[in-house]
């Protein structure tokens, strides 16, 4: 049984979400990793992914999303810059391990973006400056498409920070939809 947990991040429009996904095991260091959004009753949609194999400290950018994999720490750093209200939602990191299902990394991120002056932090504990400098060299990676059978996962409850759902077997869905966003110049 897997206990699904999530953390809530409340930020203002224009700010940057800066989170880390802990993949723990060294064997996953070079595995391709992805950042997904989970919409109620739908399969997770992949927004961005690292290269395959995933390179150490090598930024990958898809639109406003930047992924950096730090093998020395077992962490995937995810940044979403210039946040918009419509970015609000539930996100997760996964590790691609074909032909098996993607391996989910805890915790899921419940992002709430509100309108307002972006210079005012949404929270003094979990927000970052709204000005963000894009890394000079970034790569756009192609995310894989899976074609094996899939099931729609039940969307977890909309909840506050650090709330756990009851222990239950989860069926991680395969990825079919890739959201493409223009890459910054």
């Amino acid at each position: 049984a897997t206990k699904l947990t999530e953390e809530k991040y409340e930020l203002k429009e224009g700010q940057t979400l800066d989170v880390k996904c802990d993949y723990t095991l060294e064997k996953f260091a070079s595995s391709q990793k992805a950042w997904q959004i989970i919409r109620d009753g739908e399969m997770p949609k992949t927004l961005a992914c690292t290269e395959r194999p995933s390179k150490n400290s090598h930024p990958v950018q898809v639109g406003r999303i930047i992924l950096e994999d730090y093998h020395d720490h077992g962490l995937l750093r995810v940044r979403m810059v210039n946040l918009q209200v419509e970015d609000s939602g539930l996100y997760q990191c996964v590790i691609y391990q074909p032909p098996k299902e993607p391996h989910m990394l805890f915790d899921r991120i419940r992002l709430v973006v509100t309108k307002g002056f972006s210079g005012t932090p949404g929270s003094n504990e979990n927000s970052t400056q709204n000005v963000y400098k894009i890394p000079p060299t970034t790569t756009k990676a192609l995310c894989p498409l899976y074609t094996s059978p899939r099931t729609v996962t039940q969307a977890p409850p909309k909840s506050t920070a650090d709330v756990s759902t009851p222990d239950s077997e989860i069926n991680l869905t395969n990825v079919t939809d890739i959201i493409r966003v223009p890459v910054f110049n």
Epitope: T24, L25, H73, G74, L75, E125, N126
Partner: antibody, heavy 117, light 111 residues
């Protein structure tokens, strides 16, 4: 080479405050988590809390929540532990650590905090 | 919070012998297919050193004689053949739930 160096340990009176520093070299603290752990003389290890220096998000052990504050300055590649309302039972060697394997690794040498009147 | 109980409190062995240290958690520390149970070694006057992470994976630069096993609530650290430098205090620690917690330690001493 990865290195963490703690400083700021001192003798302080009960009720007093102290700020410890953890200077990192060989890696960027913004790309990892920094944890603080302490060890009272002759006792075991106790996790205090951690920070994601890039996002500023913190987690604490209930025992120190409200009295201790972890912060970080990524431009200085340094993390901090602000300790207020100190008690004699806070006497310990304080370690900062990096993160690896889902837990704490890359330990500093520790700095001694003595709370006594 | 999750309570970790280590046994024995003290283990007296000779170099070359096999050491088996146990750690029991008050609730499961396994999630997402991973057991978040780690082992540290600490010698007097030194900082702890990560030996085993995620129950069974060796930390960087750790000799092959150190191995870990277990899942759920019961875990074991095994040192296949003790070297003189292995005599120290060993702590188990869980990183499954905040607050992270440590066991009380097992002192491995020379017989």
């Amino acid at each position: 080479e990865v290195q963490l160096v703690e400083s700021g340990g001192a003798l302080v009176k009960p009720g007093g405050s102290l700020r410890l520093s953890c200077a990192a070299s060989g890696f960027n603290i913004g790309n990892t988590y920094i944890h603080w752990v302490r060890q009272a003389p002759g006792k075991g290890l106790e996790w205090i809390g951690r920070i994601d220096p890039a996002g500023g998000r913190t987690k604490y052990a209930p025992k120190v929540q409200g009295r201790f504050t972890i912060s970080a300055d990524t431009s200085k590649n340094t993390a901090y532990l602000q300790m207020n309302s100190l008690k004699t039972e806070d006497t310990a060697v304080y370690y900062c650590t990096g993160h690896y394997g889902g837990t704490m690794d890359y330990w500093g040498q520790g700095t001694l905090v003595t709370v006594s009147s | 919070e999750i309570v970790l109980t280590q046994s024995p409190a003290t283990l007296s062995l000779s170099p070359g012998e096999r050491a088996t240290l146990s750690c029991r958690a008050s609730q499961s520390v396994s999630n997402y297919g991973i057991s978040f149970l780690n082992w540290y070694q600490q010698k007097p006057g030194q900082a702890p050193r990560l030996l085993i992470y995620a129950a069974e994976y060796q930390g960087r630069g750790i000799p092959a004689r150190f191995s870990g096993s277990g899942s759920g609530t019961d875990f074991t650290l095994t040192i296949s053949s003790l070297e003189p430098e292995d005599f120290a205090v060993y702590y188990c620690q869980q990183s499954s739930n905040v607050p992270y917690t440590f066991g009380q330690g097992t002192k491995l001493e020379i017989k």
